[in-house]
Interface confidence: medium
């Protein structure tokens, strides 16, 4: 807290300019009018105040706007944003994407801070949903943003926003998140032709059910092993050897290198050995010839 002291004669600030960087903290407090500061916030970005001086300027704005800063001030906070606490930011009502971009720019190159997370939360809640432009902006600054959301939060993403998602944005998503995103992606890309559709949907396939994988196997998509290994195990298990062969196309020989890893390992255990042998890859561990395979799930459904 800066003590209230009278401004020395001739030092009253008429505008926010370079002379203020030589003011002591108490002089800034005494000589800079908060309303003047609010209207000339854009200048603060360009004048290299010390971090301690910024504390004083923040204090003045806090006194002027105890209920939270107006967006006209927020948009021009610049590096003063780094001084804000999550509690400060929760008082704000940020509606402009330009304001969001301006503040994310300040934090660019750094990890997502609690301040930024709070800012994004306030912005998205204010908009009601994660629209395409917002998602575009957030993933540009933080590629992992989408995967930091809970499945419940992801449910508010409209299918139209999925067009903004790049493959790298999904790198850290877990299966529960992909379960939510996949149906949205399927809806978003439904009018595309086969090969174009596959290129777009590929990153989301970790949330695809068996029937969709079966359908893809009929379309000569040549799925790569990296994508196959990210599929849900429960979605892969019911696929036949012929379906997996069609799904992977020339990449099928990569199964040998992955035979000890899920979902390939579990899938092999469900296939007849003679079917696996048709692949000519030397995959072992299938059901020996002559054994009867009981589909227990079907049996339970009938009883």
């Amino acid at each position: 807290e800066v003590e209230k002291t009278a401004c020395p004669s001739g030092k009253k600030a008429r505008e926010i300019d370079e002379s203020l960087i030589f003011y002591k903290k108490w002089e800034l407090e005494a000589c800079v009018d908060a309303a003047l500061l609010a209207t000339q916030m854009d200048r603060v970005n360009a004048i290299p105040f010390t971090y301690e001086q910024l504390d004083v300027l923040k204090h003045k704005l806090d006194e002027l706007y105890p209920q939270g800063y107006p967006e006209s001030v927020i948009q021009h906070l610049g590096y003063l944003f780094l001084k804000m606490s999550p509690e400060d930011i929760r008082k704000w009502n940020v509606t402009s994407l330009e304001t969001l971009k301006a503040l994310l720019e300040v934090n660019k190159g750094h990890e997502m801070s609690p301040q930024v997370a709070t800012l994004i939360d306030r912005f998205v809640k204010g908009r009601g949903q994660l629209d395409k432009d917002t998602l575009d902006t957030l993933t540009a600054f933080y590629p992992g943003y989408l995967c930091s959301l809970s499945p419940e939060e992801l449910s508010s993403v409209p299918p139209s926003s999925i067009w903004a998602v790049r493959p790298q944005d999904l790198d850290t998503c877990d299966p529960r998140q992909l379960d939510v995103l996949y149906p949205k992606a399927r809806l978003a890309f439904q009018n595309m032709n086969g090969s174009e559709y596959f290129v777009k949907i590929q990153s989301f396939l970790g949330g695809a059910p068996t029937e969709d994988l079966k359908a893809l196997s009929q379309q000569n998509v040549s799925m790569d092993l990296a994508t196959f290994m990210k599929l849900r195990t429960d979605a892969v298990l019911p696929l036949t050897v012929a379906e997996v062969q069609k799904l992977l196309g020339p990449h099928v020989e990569g199964l040998k290198a992955e035979e000890r890893h899920r979902p390939v390992r579990d899938w092999i255990l469900r296939q007849r050995q003679d079917d696996l042998d048709t692949l000519g890859l030397g995959l072992q561990g299938g059901i020996p010839n002559g054994y009867l395979v009981l589909d227990l799930s079907m049996q339970e459904a009938l009883s």
Epitope: T50, G78, E105, V106
Partner: nanobody, 118 residues
Framework: EVQLVESGGGLVQPGGSLRLSCAAS????????MGWFRQAPGKGRELVAS????????YYPDSVEGRFTISRDNAKRMVYLQMNSLRAEDTAVYYC???????????WGQGTQVTVSS
């Protein structure tokens, strides 16, 4: 620690031009602004130009507005001051300075002399 080294000063005639350079080294990931200051004999230090590190926002006092231009090259860790239409009153030692995000410390170069005289 941040080290700043200026170069490009010298003697120039009124109306002439000079380009000052400042090379930054050390821990500059938290840099938020860089500026050029000057100090004439018997006078205090004055800011003549500054540039924000996260955008291209620049600032100039009225005394140099339109004549001086500050720019930066992040890849080379350089900051430049292009000075045109120089006047006798621009004679001073020019210092490059840096301010950091996380601290209130200033980092200063050693300075480079600029003399404007016929």
């Amino acid at each position: 620690e941040v080290q700043l080294v200026e170069s490009g000063g010298g003697l120039v005639q009124p109306g002439g031009s000079l380009r000052l350079s400042c090379a930054a080294s050390g821990s500059i990931s938290d840099l938020y602004a860089m500026g050029w200051f000057r100090q004439a004999p018997g006078k205090g230090r004055e800011l003549v130009a500054s540039i924000n590190s996260f955008s291209d926002i620049t600032y100039y006092p009225d005394s140099v507005e339109g004549r001086f231009t500050i720019s930066r090259d992040n890849a080379k860790r350089m900051v430049y001051l292009q000075m045109n239409s120089l006047r006798a009153e621009d004679t001073a030692v020019y210092y490059c300075a840096a301010r950091m995000i996380k601290k209130g410390f200033d980092y200063w170069g050693q300075g480079t002399q600029v003399t404007v005289s016929s």
